[in-house]
């Protein structure tokens, strides 16, 4: 039985050219996290954090994606095309997979508000 819940940074906005932290947190489960996958809105993989092998950033994102903090991901040099959904998938033993959703809006405005609140989707 899957007892855990994924908390995410929910809906966030950030300034074009700036950076943003995508963060998911798994709680309320004894399960062991063996891998975390980060995907973009078009289902392309940005990065994988494997318990044994560590981080792997996919080549297309190497220049703009930094691992961490923790199991999260930092997106840098944001463009308008980065607007959209992002998903974290936690592979856990023995529960199975937990999936969290974050919506990022990249703003042209010079004073974009950076709202980052934790919520359960």
């Amino acid at each position: 039985m899957m007892t855990g819940t994924i908390e995410t940074t929910g809906n966030i906005s950030a300034k074009k050219g700036g950076s943003v932290i995508l963060q998911c947190h798994l709680s309320s489960t004894m399960a062991q996290v063996t891998q975390v996958n980060w995907e973009q809105h078009d289902h392309s993989l940005l990065a994988i954090r494997n318990a044994e092998l560590g981080w792997h950033i996919y080549p297309a994102f190497k220049d703009r994606v930094a691992p961490g903090p923790g199991l999260g991901l930092t997106l840098q040099s944001l463009t308008m095309n980065d607007t959209g959904e992002y998903f974290c998938t936690y592979h856990t033993y023995p529960d199975g997979t937990y999936r969290g959703r974050i919506f990022l809006e990249v703003l042209e405005s010079s004073v974009a508000e950076h709202s980052a609140r934790f919520q359960i989707p």
């Epitope: 062991q32 063996t34 891998q35 044994e52 529960d95």
Partner: antibody
Framework: QVQLVQSGSDLKKPGASVRVSCKAS????????MNWVRQAPGHGLEWMGW????????TYVQGFTGRFVFSLDTSVNTAYLQISSLKAEDTAVYFC???????????????WGQGTMVTVSS | DIQLTQSPTFLSASVGDRVTITCRAS??????LAWYQQNPGKAPKLLIY???TLQSGVPSRFSGSGSGTEFTLTISSLQPEDFVTYYC?????????FGQGTKVEIK
């Protein structure tokens, strides 16, 4: 190479306690969950539960609560199974087994200890 | 809890035979199933995971198939060392139960 080496066979009297050790080598101990499996003489495999090697939190299957304790010493890459108040029906081979595979669809017990025979007899 | 039922419990066959062992789950487990081989007095050995993926080093005469609730382990041509016991196990959440085992005996 990746291996799990268990402590040797043990003969105990009813009411006594026993501790079985499982020493891991050849991989990062805290990256893989560890399981305990019992096999009574002439019987099949019975999953007793597992321990989260990151947090040390154990999970016990129904029927293996109370007298059974899973623990870790990550400084020496070793998992332990302790059984207290031993009964004749605890006589069995006890295996430790690593959960291999990193994604949910690829989990399996890919590395096993050689097994430890625990005999409970007066 | 998800229960696994293996059939047959005993199987008599000859060297060179093709044999199939079935494992049925009491509810859908996708493809989260593994098969193990156990020699008497030894630890089980992983043969197949994810229902059909052959573990490294395992001979290609072993194959697995199925998804959902019905799975099979096939040995295409039995060798003398294959006359042992086989177990299926689901890894679709807690508890990760094993089937009761299938003993393959020489006819």
């Amino acid at each position: 190479q990746v291996q799990l080496v268990q402590s040797g066979s043990d003969l105990k009297k009813p009411g006594a306690s026993v501790r079985v050790s499982c020493k891991a080598s050849g991989y990062t101990f805290t990256s893989y969950p560890m399981n305990w499996v019992r096999q009574a003489p002439g019987h099949g495999l019975e999953w007793m539960g597992w321990i989260n090697t990151n947090t040390g939190n154990p999970t016990y299957v129904q029927g293996f609560t109370g007298r059974f304790v899973f623990s870790l010493d990550t400084s020496v890459n070793t998992a332990y199974l302790q059984i207290s108040s031993l009964k004749a029906e605890d006589t069995a081979v006890y295996f430790c087994a690593r959960t291999g595979g990193h994604t949910y669809d690829s989990y399996a017990f890919d590395v096993w200890g050689q097994g430890t025979m625990v005999t409970v007899s007066s | 809890d998800i229960q696994l039922t293996q059939s047959p419990t005993f199987l008599s066959a000859s060297v060179g035979d093709r044999v199939t062992i079935t494992c049925r789950a009491s509810q859908v487990i996708s493809s989260s199933l593994a098969w193990y081989q156990q020699n008497p007095g030894k630890a089980p050995k992983l043969l197949i995971y994810a229902a059909s993926t052959l573990q490294s080093g395992v001979p290609s005469r072993f194959s697995g198939s199925g998804s959902g609730t019905e799975f099979t382990l096939t040995i295409s041509s039995l060798q003398p060392e294959d006359f042992v016991t086989y177990y299926c196990q689901h890894l679709h959440g807690y508890p990760c139960n094993f089937g009761q085992g299938t003993k393959v005996e020489i006819k």
